[in-house]
Interface confidence: low
């Protein structure tokens, strides 16, 4: 599998992974103890015909072209968890691995 | 996990799974021996704030609102394989399980 990496200076218009730091303090999410911020990344860009398509299905739907089908869109195709320390709804401190918090790769699906 | 199912008569505008039969013969894909057609389904519809969001990451990126971030899009969140009989590039007949050919569920990611 392959995915493009870009930054805010890139001129790449195709589907790409961009850096994004999520700052829980800036969001006012005070129930998160740690980390206060983390590198989440995000996906953005165009999904032209067969570029970075993750599944054969995407290509088939593009060919069949049903009414209302959006065509592929640039979305995470590989994600990873982070460990977090947070208060749950009962004000208990929980330490846990939260899945799908970091985008490792972007593709068209 | 939860996803909406729709058909061509549905008035649902949100992210939904729609039926789609892929016909390999109609595509001229004569290297596929069987099946000649199969139910692939596809995803279409709007992804409003937190509707059917698969990952917490999706919500966080929406909040951080980086330049050019796409927001969630309606895409397969669960897929399944089908068994296929086909000619490979060397004209050999192959029987194999092809992953991610059928959309079982759609969501916003």
């Amino acid at each position: 599998d392959f995915g493009l990496d870009c930054d805010e200076h890139s001129t790449e218009s195709r589907c790409c992974r961009y850096p994004l730091t999520v700052d829980f303090e800036a969001f006012g999410w005070d129930w998160i103890i740690a980390p206060k911020r983390y590198k989440a990344n995000y996906c953005s860009g165009e999904c032209e015909f067969v570029f970075l398509q993750k599944y054969p299905h995407t290509h088939l739907v593009h060919q069949a072209n049903p009414r209302g089908s959006a065509g592929p869109c640039c979305t995470p195709t590989k994600m990873s968890p982070i460990n977090m320390l947070y208060f749950n709804g009962k004000e208990q401190i929980i330490y846990g691995k939260i899945p799908a918090m970091v985008v490792d790769r972007c593709g068209c699906s | 996990d939860f996803g909406l199912d729709c058909d061509e008569h549905s008035t649902e505008s949100r992210c939904c799974r729609y039926p789609l039969t892929v016909d390999f013969e109609a595509f001229g894909w004569d290297w596929i021996i069987a099946p000649k057609r199969y139910k692939a389904n596809y995803c279409s519809g709007e992804c409003e704030f937190v509707f059917l969001q698969k990952y917490p990451h999706t919500h966080l990126v929406h909040q951080a609102n980086p330049r050019g971030s796409a927001g969630p899009c309606c895409t397969p969140t669960k897929m399944s394989p089908i068994n296929m009989l086909y000619f490979n590039g060397k004209e050999q007949i192959i029987y194999g399980k092809i992953p991610a050919m059928v959309v079982d569920r759609c969501g916003c990611s």
Epitope: F27, C74 | E48, F49, R67, G68, C73, C74
Partner: antibody, heavy 124, light 107 residues
């Protein structure tokens, strides 16, 4: 139905501040970005910035960044735009507008509902 | 910032006419263009988004087209209520920028 109702006209002196309010009804206020756009008399439209009521995160047009603050009060579903150090060329109608996100690709949204506008006159 | 150049700045037409207004961006805006109608003393009203999609409730006599840097709004058969000022807006990049407007007047 979805509605944005803005505060009444204001007359201010140069150097003063103005705070315009925009009260939302008929939808979940926290789920949609609110934008502010202004229009000087007989002129075109100018984007000032936006705010996400869910968390107060905002983006400002660099042209106003030093003088503008956008805030929200989720308990009353109201957005506010404060402009400081007013000058005569800030005389304009100020609009709030809701960003409707239809969500299939980058920047997939449009302004579906606008406030009626608030005339701010800056004059000595 | 992305500059949006709208033309013409004013236009005289008659009821029943077909009119075209154009908007040119200083760089590719990926079809992230909206069109608005504004009548005197009123807030703008969204007509078209994503270059060619019609906002719900807007009559089909309004249509949009274009890609890259060049976009067009067409009104197929002018009615008295269509005489107003029209603006384009790019929402591909912050800061959002509007065209300077086209005033459509009765001939």
């Amino acid at each position: 139905q979805v509605q944005l109702v803005q505060s009444g006209a204001e007359v201010k002196k140069p150097g003063a501040s103005v705070k315009v309010s925009c009260k939302a009804s008929g939808y979940s206020f926290t789920g949609y970005f609110m934008h502010w756009v202004r229009q000087a008399p007989g002129q075109g439209l100018e984007w000032m910035g936006n705010i996400y009521p869910y968390n107060g995160v905002s983006n400002y047009n660099q042209r106003f960044k030093a003088r503008v603050t956008m805030t929200t009060d989720t308990s009353t579903s109201t957005a506010y735009m404060e402009l400081r150090s007013l000058r005569s060329d800030d005389t304009a109608v100020y609009y709030c507008a809701r960003r409707y996100y239809y969500g299939t690709g980058p920047a997939d949204w449009y302004f579906d509902v606008w406030g009626q506008g608030t005339l701010v006159t800056v004059s000595s | 910032d992305i500059q949006m150049t709208q033309s013409p700045s004013s236009l005289s037409a008659s009821v029943g006419d077909r009119v075209t207004i154009t908007c040119k961006a200083s760089q590719d805006i990926n079809s992230y263009l909206s069109w608005f109608q504004q009548k005197p003393g009123k807030a703008p009203k969204s007509l078209i988004y994503r270059a060619n999609r019609l906002v719900d409730g807007v009559p089909s006599k309004f249509s949009g087209s274009g890609s890259g840097t060049d976009y067009t709004l067409t009104i197929s058969s002018l009615q008295p209520e269509d005489f107003a000022t029209y603006y384009c807006l790019q929402c591909d990049e912050f800061p959002l920028t509007f065209g300077q407007g086209t005033k459509l007047e009765i001939k």
